[in-house]
């Protein structure tokens, strides 16, 4: 089965690597502009050259392309704890990311938040915070993880799935309360 | 004690609008960012939109943007979502939410609002 192809890339297919069908005449094939800059007019022929400036300030280009704008810069969202790991150029767009002893979780493929990475305070590391999930952590007996800490089986109550952790704890403690009345 | 508490939903056609509003109490309203997620049928929930302090920055998934726009009252403790040309696959309870910041959880969200695209 052939894949479908949308028209641009029916378009550039019959040109060579690097070429791309002049939009007006389709028997020219124009040379793409180099990442960083934009198409700013088709080459007028065969051989000639394509018109291609610089991406201004806040814009970029990151491959080579025969688009008509640059690409606008990201901004970095602070709402979300994001910091700017690198700036844009007219090459590269802006790279967000996290602060040290942070993780990345993303609400959707373009939304992430920054959290702070969990301690395991009463447990240990099982797992160490990397950059897009957080410390795994094992709890130590007597305490059950919720929402990655480790809370004491105290606060156990018998509706949550933290029963069949700190039942044995429990039976554990009724045990030795048992043994100590003979 | 936190409170939200969402109105607005019901029924309404393809190409049909709503307004949603959520009234918030129990915290400073004004300092804190602010979430719409929903829950289509049978679905995780989706983060919709959200909305900083101030109103200024807002954020639109892909989903909807150009069709939902999110806003805030501050001196009413209100947050809204306008919805237009809703489309049968926005059907969903929609949930306004304080923006999560110990962990990637809603500690405060409130009890949701159906909305039912449908002809």
């Known amino acids: 089965l052939v894949p479908h192809l949308g028209d641009r890339e029916k378009r550039d297919s019959v040109c060579p690597q690097g070429k791309y069908i002049h939009p007006q005449n389709n028997s020219i094939c124009c040379t793409k502009c180099h990442k960083g800059t934009y198409l700013y007019n088709d080459c007028p022929g065969p051989g000639q050259d394509t018109d291609c400036r610089e991406c201004e300030s806040g814009s970029f280009t990151a491959s080579e392309n025969h688009l008509r704008h640059c690409l606008s810069c990201s901004k970095c969202r602070k709402e979300m704890g994001q910091v700017e790991i690198s700036s844009c150029t007219v090459d590269r767009d802006t790279v967000c990311g996290c602060r040290k002893n942070q993780y990345r979780h993303y609400w959707s493929e373009n939304l992430f938040q920054c959290f702070n990475c969990s301690l395991c305070l009463n447990g240990t590391v099982h797992l160490s915070c990397q950059e897009k999930q957080n410390t795994v952590c094992t709890c130590h007996a007597g305490f059950f993880l919720r929402e990655n800490e480790c809370v004491s089986c105290s606060n156990c109550k018998k509706s949550l799935e933290c029963t069949k952790l700190c039942l044995p704890q429990i039976e554990n403690v009724k045990g030795t309360e048992d043994s100590g009345t003979t | 004690e936190v409170q939200l508490l969402e109105s607005g939903g019901g029924l309404v056609q393809p190409g049909g609008s709503l307004r949603l509003s959520c009234a918030a109490s129990g915290f400073t309203f004004e300092n804190k960012t602010m979430v719409w997620v929903r829950q289509a049928p049978g679905k995780g929930l989706e983060w919709v939109s959200h909305?900083?302090?101030?109103?200024?920055?807002?954020y639109y998934a892909d989903s909807v943007k150009g069709r939902f726009t999110i806003s805030r009252d501050n001196s009413k403790n209100t947050l809204y979502l306008q919805m237009n040309s809703l489309r049968a696959e926005d059907t969903a309870v929609y949930y306004c939410a304080l923006l999560p910041k110990r962990g990637p959880w809603f500690d405060y969200r409130g009890q949701g609002t159906l909305v039912t695209v449908s002809s």
């Open positions: 909305i900083d302090a101030t109103g200024t920055i807002t």
